[in-house]
């Protein structure tokens, strides 16, 4: 029975050339987190494994930094970074929890954070 929920930063925006922190938090479960994957719809960005530590996808090595915590920092943002990002929590014994964040990279200096939301 999967009882946990993932809380994410929801819909967020950031300026072109700037950086943004993607954050998820798993709550309401005592399951052990063995690995967190950060992915786009068609691309693995990074994994944080309890034993292996952080592993950044080689093609993102220059623009992605691990942390804070289990979060991920995207740097040198371009408009092409606009889109969905997923935090995938591998847990034992529950299984896999997935959270979604939508990032919009703006040309202007107007960048506001959206509301937080939960995915069961």
């Amino acid at each position: 029975m999967m009882t946990g929920t993932i809380e994410t930063t929801g819909n967020i925006s950031a300026e072109k050339g700037g950086s943004i922190i993607l954050q998820c938090h798993l709550s309401s479960t005592t399951a052990q987190v063995t690995q967190v994957n950060w992915e786009q719809q068609d691309q693995l960005l990074a994994i944080c494994n309890a034993d292996l530590g952080w592993h950044i996808s080689p093609s993102f090595k220059d623009r992605v930094a691990p942390g804070p915590g289990l979060g991920l920092t995207l740097q040198s943002l371009t408009v092409n970074d606009t889109g969905e990002y997923f935090c995938i929590y591998h847990t034992y014994p529950d299984g896999t929890y997935t959270g979604r964040i939508f990032l919009e990279v703006l040309e202007s200096s107007v960048a506001e954070h959206g509301a937080r939301f939960q995915i069961p």
């Epitope: 690995q35 952080w54 592993h55 950044i56």
Partner: antibody, heavy 121, light 113 residues
């Protein structure tokens, strides 16, 4: 081009240890995970463990935990797999493999040629 | 751990005919959140290391002939060779690519009838 060059065949007595090396070239060693896989004669593939050369962290198949030790030397771009307390069932070909990122997936994309370890009294 | 079960253990097919290999996982390899199946297929010829054929259950590795195709979702997957060629004689393995340990199926030995 990417290459994983493994050390030569070994013959060991039961109870001894063996250390197999896997020298990587043609890519940035610390940017990719290295996996180790066992293949006993006429048998299938069995995952032993993995190392992240960037962090030094390693993870093992429970079956090999305590007997297998995987390490990496960044200065020589070489990964090692040491297996202790050898027994006859450890007679096998041992492969190292690089883990590449293919889209959303971690894939064993380049493999060493394999190292034959024979355990015999 | 995720257990991967392949069938059949061995298969003999005539040249030019279709070969089908099945793989079943003990847990779902589908992440429904992003609709991805974490399953790979490898080919191993005698005296050689395995070679990647397919990842993501259905995406062919570059350079792999289009007679090889992968299908399936969740716990049930299939590798199909549409028209068997002599060079396809090998052992084929499916692999759980979802979470460590990255377990392999027991292998299917493909021969020419």
């Amino acid at each position: 081009q990417v290459q994983l060059q493994q050390s030569g065949a070994e013959v060991k007595k039961p109870g001894a240890s063996v250390k197999v090396s896997c020298k990587a070239s043609g890519y940035a060693f610390t940017n990719y995970l290295i996996e180790w896989v066992k293949q006993a004669p006429g048998q299938g593939l069995e995952w032993i463990g993995v190392i992240n050369p960037g962090s030094g962290g390693s993870k093992y198949n429970e079956k090999f935990k305590g007997r297998a030790t995987i390490t990496a030397d960044k200065s020589t771009s070489t990964a090692y797999m040491e297996l202790s307390s050898l027994r006859s069932e450890d007679t096998a070909v041992y492969f190292c493999a690089r883990t590449g990122v293919y889209g959303n997936f971690l894939i064993f994309d380049y493999w060493g040629q394999g190292t034959t370890v024979t355990v015999s009294s | 751990d995720i257990v991967m079960t392949q069938s059949p253990d061995s298969l003999a097919v005539s040249l030019g005919e279709r070969a089908t290999i099945n793989c079943k996982s003990s847990q779902s390899l589908l992440n429904s959140g992003i609709q991805k199946n974490y399953l790979a297929w490898y080919q191993q010829k005698p005296g050689q290391p395995p070679k990647l054929l397919i990842y993501g259950a259905s995406t062919r590795e570059s350079g792999v002939p289009d007679r090889f195709s992968g299908s399936g979702s969740g716990t049930d997957f299939t590798l199909t060779i549409s028209s068997l060629q002599a060079e396809d004689v090998a052992v084929y393995y499916c692999q759980n690519d979802h979470r460590y340990p990255f377990t392999f199926g027991g292998g299917t030995k493909l021969e020419i009838k």
